[in-house]
């Protein structure tokens, strides 16, 4: 039985050209996290964080995706095309897969303020 819950940074906004941190946290389970995958709205993989082996940033994103903090991901040099859904997928044993959703809005306005909060989707 899957007892865990994923907390995420929820809906966030950030300035074009700036950076943003995507964060997820798995709680309420004793399952072993073997891998965390970060995916974009079109289901392309951004990065994999393997529990033992560390980070693999996908080649297409190497120049503007940075690992961390923690199991999170930092997106840099944001463009308007980065607006959309992001998913953290926790692969665990023996529970299986947990998935969290974050919506990022990239704003043109120079006065756009980065807003973030942890929430349970």
């Amino acid at each position: 039985m899957m007892t865990g819950t994923i907390e995420t940074t929820g809906n966030i906004s950030a300035k074009k050209g700036g950076s943003v941190i995507l964060q997820c946290h798995l709680s309420s389970t004793m399952a072993q996290v073997t891998q965390v995958n970060w995916e974009q709205h079109d289901h392309s993989l951004l990065a994999i964080r393997n529990a033992e082996l560390g980070w693999h940033i996908y080649p297409a994103f190497k120049d503007r995706v940075a690992p961390g903090p923690g199991l999170g991901l930092t997106l840099q040099s944001l463009t308007m095309n980065d607006t959309g859904e992001y998913f953290c997928t926790y692969h665990t044993y023996p529970d299986g897969t947990y998935r969290g959703r974050i919506f990022l809005e990239v704003l043109e306005s120079s006065v756009a303020e980065h807003s973030a909060r942890f929430q349970i989707p």
Epitope: N37, E39, I48, E52, L53, G54, H56, T97
Partner: antibody
Amino acid sequence: EVQLQESGPGLVKPSETLSLTCAVSGYSITSDSWNWIRQPPGKKLEWMGYISYSGNTYYNPSLKSRITISRDTSKNQFSLKLSSVTAADTAVYYCARLDFSNYGGAVDYWGQGTTVTVSS
Amino acid sequence: DIVMTQTPLSLSVTPGQPASISCKASQNVRTAVAWYQQKPGQSPQLMIYSASYRYTGVPDRFSGSGSGTDFTLKISRVEAEDVGVYYCQQYYTTPWTFGGGTKVEIK
């Protein structure tokens, strides 16, 4: 260049423990991930598990109760032990390196493989 | 575990002609797929990673494509040295799993 060489007995009796060693040259096993992969006759390649640069291990759940992967950094080698073997463990066994940072779970260096037969 | 299914089982190709190998995943693996070539009497060699990126030294006649559940390895012009068995592998989630292989032969 990275080179891997498997060694160990080619014949193991049922219920005994299969033991193989992989000697690594041209690269330190305190970097990257060091894997065992096998292929039974006529079947798919099966990833068995790995030991990481830090010495942590991860095993395929299908083998978890029988498999141990360890390392000897002074000899730059790592080893596989598989207990309670049956005929189903007859396979070509490969040791392999995986550079996770650059290639994810894709294996970039393989040993030449060693055939192990389980038979009485 | 994720099951990787390759088609066809074997392929006989005239030199200079193209060849295409398919790999289907039992669930969405995004682009976490690698392809290997195993020549007769040798161990597998990495050809493609992240579904479409050629590994160092791999000739540009080899290309990988696909995402989600359907992946393809293409050889634009088959040469005699391309004979062997080709395997796909997913690393979207552990345990990482392989396809059953496709044998490429020369006519």
